[in-house]
């Protein structure tokens, strides 16, 4: 039950995280015009990964896409790449994890296969989250560097007479969305990996073996009862996951690679 909950929660958290990563990637407010200690302009500038926007005092907003690929800063290209990789890995992870969910039964898929898929999706979510966090952090670092550079020469004098307003940019809402979303995807991935350990028993506990007493067709399922002899008990103090009431045929599955430590 706990494993199913952990897996389900991991899936939901990752789903929210990936939705957040997609939202952050699409958002225009990666950097916003810094209004602190700056002349109050009647227009407000903000920029995203794909376009820059200007909101005028009338409320009219005009956005212009970056229609060049080669002319863009390498760092911006890197951030775009990281976010897209994060989204792609996250999307694949979600697809894999749907089939890996314990609560969803697909044909006669074994627990070992589900464990594999859960682990795979978990790793994908972790990498996806890390990509998003890395992308957002690279952009944030770029902003901080540019902020202090523009602060150093905020007003560039021309003959001491004319001043030029230097537009400084600070962290936009998308950065915070990206950081939170990346963190959630990462947490979801870790939860999936933890759920995978529960799905796959770490030692052979003879759960699937039928012991036939001579002349009788009675099947003993060691570990099912808390026998005082300790026979079939979890000698290593590790939780044995009993998948619930099943028919004998269902229980008799072949040992998988997860049964051997």
């Amino acid at each position: 039950m706990a494993v199913t909950a952990c897996q389900g929660l991991g899936f939901v958290v990752s789903l929210i995280g990936i939705a957040g990563i997609i939202a952050a990637t699409c958002m225009d407010q990666w950097s916003t015009q810094d209004l602190y200690n700056n002349p109050v302009t009647a227009v407000f500038n903000y920029q995203g990964l794909w376009r820059s926007c200007v909101r005028e005092s009338s409320g009219f907003t005009e956005c212009r896409g970056y229609f060049t690929l080669l002319g863009l800063p390498a760092m911006l290209q890197a951030v775009r790449a990281l976010m897209i990789v994060g989204i792609v890995l996250g999307a694949i992870g979600l697809l894999v994890s749907i089939f890996a969910l314990k609560c969803i039964r697909i044909g006669s898929m074994e627990d070992s296969a589900k464990a594999n898929m859960t682990l795979t999706s978990g790793i994908m979510f972790i990498v996806s989250g890390l990509c998003a966090i890395a992308g957002v952090s690279v952009f944030a670092n770029m902003l901080v560097t540019n902020f202090w550079m523009s602060t150093a020469n905020m007003y560039t004098g021309m003959g001491g007479m004319v001043q030029t307003v230097q537009t400084r940019y600070t962290f936009g809402a998308a950065l915070f969305v990206g950081w939170v979303a990346g963190g959630l995807t990462l947490i979801g991935g870790v939860m999936m990996c933890i759920a995978c350990r529960g799905l796959a028993p770490e030692e052979t506990n003879y759960k699937a073996v039928s012991y036939h007493a001579s002349g009788h067709s009675v099947a003993y399922k060691p570990g099912g009862f808390k026998a005082s002899t300790g026979f079939g008990s979890n000698t290593k103090n590790k939780k044995i996951y009993d998948g619930g009431a099943r028919t004998e045929d269902e229980v008799q599955s072949y040992p998988s690679k997860h049964d051997y430590v």
Epitope: V40, S52, V54, G59, Q163, V165
Partner: antibody
Amino acid sequence: QVQLVQSGAEVKKPGASVKVSCKASGYTFTTYPIEWVRQAPGQRLEWMGNFHPYNDDTKYNEKFKGRVTITRDTSASTAYMELSSLRSEDTAVYYCARRAYGYPYAMDYWGQGTLVTVSS
Amino acid sequence: DIVMTQSPDSLAVSLGERATINCKSSQSLLNAGNQKNYLTWYQQKPGQPPKLLIYRASSRESGVPDRFSGSGSGTDFTLTISSLQAEDVAVYYCQNDYIYPYTFGGGTKLEIK
């Protein structure tokens, strides 16, 4: 067609207050900001403040040090500008103007002006 | 506040001739975000409110004759009337439409020579 009709001329004593109204018609009042500009005799135009309906934000020229208050009555499609603690140098023609949304980004329609005379 | 300086204060030009009015701002009116200059030109005739001519330094308002044109960027701007007509006699104002408080130039009185 777009029209901004202002209230009539006023004569005020120093220290008093004046409230000028500006009734808009021919467009959706809540879509466009209203700006207030004054012009003293023989002087340049002077921006006083504005009201932005899209975010209910009001901006004022610091020069007026809290003496000016811009309000509006949406149901009557009317904007108001109140100037308090009047002095003789406040004698001017007061204009309301509509700031266009998008293109042009400017004050595209103006009221006819309200002459306010401050005299003891 | 941004100081807008217009020159000349008054200008007398013959009918059909070119009239040029200059405007200089103490700070750049160029917005880096969209590379637009937020400078506006108005025409004011005696006893009338100002009339919008040019916005964003070079865009002509609809209904304004094409003999009116605006140019310039950053801090230096020009209003040009290519062929002066009798109805163009007025005072012309440039305005900073970028940084609060919005400020106007002192005006240039255009007359016929």
